[in-house]
Amino acid sequence: LRPSRVHNSEENTMRALTLKDILNGTFSYKTFFPNWISGQEYLHQSADNNIVLYNIETGQSYTILSNRTMKSVNASNYGLSPDRQFVYLESDYSKLWRYSYTATYYIYDLSNGEFVRGNELPRPIQYLCWSPVGSKLAYVYQNNIYLKQRPGDPPFQITFNGRENKIFNGIPDWVYEEEMLATKYALWWSPNGKFLAYAEFNDTDIPVIAYSYYGDEQYPRTINIPYPKAGAKNPVVRIFIIDTTYPAYVGPQEVPVPAMIASSDYYFSWLTWVTDERVCLQWLKRVQNVSVLSICDFREDWQTWDCPKTQEHIEESRTGWAGGFFVSTPVFSYDAISYYKIFSDKDGYKHIHYIKDTVENAIQITSGKWEAINIFRVTQDSLFYSSNEFEEYPGRRNIYRISIGSYPPSKKCVTCHLRKERCQYYTASFSDYAKYYALVCYGPGIPISTLHDGRTDQEIKILEENKELENALKNIQLPKEEIKKLEVDEITLWYKMILPPQFDRSKKYPLLIQVYGGPCSQSVRSVFAVNWISYLASKEGMVIALVDGRGTAFQGDKLLYAVYRKLGVYEVEDQITAVRKFIEMGFIDEKRIAIWGWSYGGYVSSLALASGTGLFKCGIAVAPVSSWEYYASVYTERFMGLPTKDDNLEHYKNSTVMARAEYFRNVDYLLIHGTADDNVHFQNSAQIAKALVNAQVDFQAMWYSDQNHGLSGLSTNHLYTHMTHFLKQCFSLSD
């Protein structure tokens, strides 16, 4: 009996998570990504904010920039020039959209310990970067691109047509930033800094979304964003390259668009430099099932860029859209013409292929009923990539090395057995030539970052092990987590179940489904998290489940492309199917089941609540899409085609939340949205509310004034407190 008595007394000293813990970020973790500057050196910002250079081989470290210098301009970020002569310091950070922000930049000269005076940079700057070699600067100011040969030099203006909300040079417009490039920049230096490539986006003809920003003034401001919704006019993109050695000599040269792409509406999807005189551009038809990779060469005689048809590689999907979320980007080999790329194999799984002359002749490098996720690095003898192959868990990520310098190429899992229970979800960061690399493990245990030798894979040192977090969690009753699968009608539904600490299968628990469910997403991942749902399980005794249904990623094209042109159908069906299976498990109180989601998850939760199944007592939709006609063209059309009669208008109309207004009558619905949501416009929730009012259906709602899609800051606390009250009330849990 003694051990059991000790166990009980230990449990009594442990406490459940509180909502305050979550809102205060008490149990957040740290990761360590080295800022590599060579094969064996990296920079890191120390705890006291000094910028320190570490040399792995000598074991030495020294401060290259003191916290005093950082503080003198209130810098929150920095960037060392490749010749190590200068550092830019970034301050006055002002967020714009998901990736974009403006800032003030100061250049610090390391050789004399002073800030560069004369020809200072204008403010605020939209984007700034060093050339990959030396210390040239390229920056974007007021939608135009400027070049400096040295930080103290006067700038050379490359573009002159930049205009707010009209012409964007070197930076993306809203839709390219959010849905195509996923960056704040649209300019790319060639490997040795000879050329600078950039995109020009012309938004002149794009319809504008306008919404009020209330602020503190007597009159609200109106925010105007050129935002192409499904079927609307899209940005017109052009790619230019300028010789930065003699920028005035011939000026920017436009890169030709492949003829098969230029024949109708198209997108530019990414640019990859191969050598200083060879560049690879990827293009996509507006109907996003055809992608063309075009390799272009510099013609010295004409000072132009030539993209021969023989160097055009077409990637086409016959079962869905091209690629996963985005079309994958190539990783070039040392011959500077052949490359490695992830795309679907004949069995419908995304795998690494080696392409030399044609895509038809591609050599498949990885294969199996799992997917290659990312190619990190290709060296002369090794290719490093991540996949979810190990033990057939799609929600894991391990790092593999394929020896490509010999035949047959041998494969080794670098991470599978390192910390098997603690670490099942990795990413990696490589130094030049993959001499060293950092592994960042995200869970399921407490995250840990380690440094490794690129030849032997030996662990050199622990970079961050989150000891304080480990100690803080020692007296916390964390919920239990299970990742399992359901087999239903030839579909595998992976789920994560979060169970109360003293879970007892013979008891009945309220169930909350947390859903995202968007195309090419994955919610069931072996990662560490102490968040709101952890609290709901730990303190409030709820069971929470996340389910990856049709349309989700990394389990093959059959599952991924099942939702093609039919958003809002199978994602919802699969959540409902899973709930029925959970009820069959015997520990769910079927009178107390709720569903909640944010963004795409808000759309799915709304449709699930309005499915008429009677399964859900209540639910929450945060910033939901309510009609695909209201969302961005690039994202929506990828999965839905066009909202035209001769394409897919019928399903656009059939898949709205508003069309199901009547069905909300028998559920408790909480609808939440930020009024300044630039992404999923407040319009979406306004239309749901209007439809519910017109149908005389009661519901609850909360708006967050001047908040965007992230509902950050104090709104976060208010949001989670409000949702907690709603759920506790729904589940008849005492406050």
Epitope: P308, T310, Q311, S333, Y334, D335, A336, I337, S338, Y354, K356, D357, T358, N361, I363, Q380, D381, I404, G405, S406, Y407, P408
Partner: antibody, heavy 122, light 106 residues
Framework: EVQLLESGGGLVQPGGSLKLSCAAS????????MSWVRQAPGKGLEWIGE????????NYTPSLKDKFIISRDNAKNTLYLQMSKVRSEDTALYYC???????????????WGQGTTVTVSS | LVMTQSPASLSASVGETVTITCRAS??????LAWYQQKQGKSPQLLVY???TLADGVPSRFSGSGSGTQYSLKINSLQPEDFGSYYC?????????FGGGTKLEIK
């Protein structure tokens, strides 16, 4: 020492068939791409085709695709060329060649046999 | 892809330097090999990747070029260098050979 020894050549009538063999020794045959190359009397070299180590990829020169079949038996360390529907222009010295893997993903013809002669005549 | 070799034949003396060229009908991106074939013998690999010497090949041989134009240079010709030379591309199948260059003693 690496050795490739072709056999099976000889006189064959137009429209007939013949199977050439290439016995390999002195290297790990099962890890090498192998090729067949021919040389008509007094003429240059003509690439016939190649086969990868596990026989999953076989490429031919288009004009010979329908009449020649390349295969291999790694257990016997032997490469084969099955010739059918032969014509007088198929008269040549037939070489088998094998080579090292060269990064990235191609193979040179480092080792050559001494060749076997095929004469097509009625 | 068609490989055009020139000259078709060439006479030179021991100690001389000679250059043989090979033109491809399309860009073969350095995927080129050179072979030497002596009378009555099998071909022997000299150069691959356009400029890398195969094991055991004397340093008087050198390969160069890019795109569609390639050449093989032999410095200070030795008696054993006489014979036929062939280029072959490895860019895409079929891996065609050039027509050959016959190098004879003057």
């Amino acid at each position: 020492e690496v050795q490739l020894l072709e056999s099976g050549g000889g006189l064959v009538q137009p429209g007939g068939s013949l199977k050439l063999s290439c016995a390999a020794s002195g290297f790990d045959f099962s890890r090498y791409w192998m090729s067949w190359v021919r040389q008509a009397p007094g003429k240059g070299l003509e690439w016939i085709g190649e086969i990868n180590p596990d026989s999953s990829t076989i490429n031919y020169t288009p004009s010979l695709k329908d009449k020649f079949i390349i295969s291999r038996d790694n257990a016997k360390n032997t490469l084969y060329l099955q010739m059918s529907k032969v014509r007088s222009e198929d008269t040549a010295l037939y070489y088998c060649a094998g080579g090292y893997y060269r990064y990235p993903y191609y193979y040179t013809m480092d080792y050559w046999g001494q060749g076997t002669t095929v004469t097509v005549s009625s | 892809l068609v490989m055009t070799q020139s000259p078709a034949s060439l006479s030179a003396s021991v100690g001389e330097t000679v250059t043989i060229t090979c033109r491809a009908s399309g860009n073969i991106h350095n995927y080129l090999a050179w072979y030497q074939q002596k009378q009555g013998k099998s071909p022997q690999l000299l150069v691959y990747n356009a400029k890398t010497l195969a094991d055991g090949v004397p340093s008087r041989f050198s390969g160069s070029g890019s795109g569609t134009q390639y050449s093989l240079k032999i410095n200070s010709l030795q008696p054993e260098d006489f014979g036929s030379y062939y280029c072959q591309h490895f860019w895409s199948t079929p891996y065609t050979f050039g027509g050959g260059t016959k190098l004879e003693i003057k």
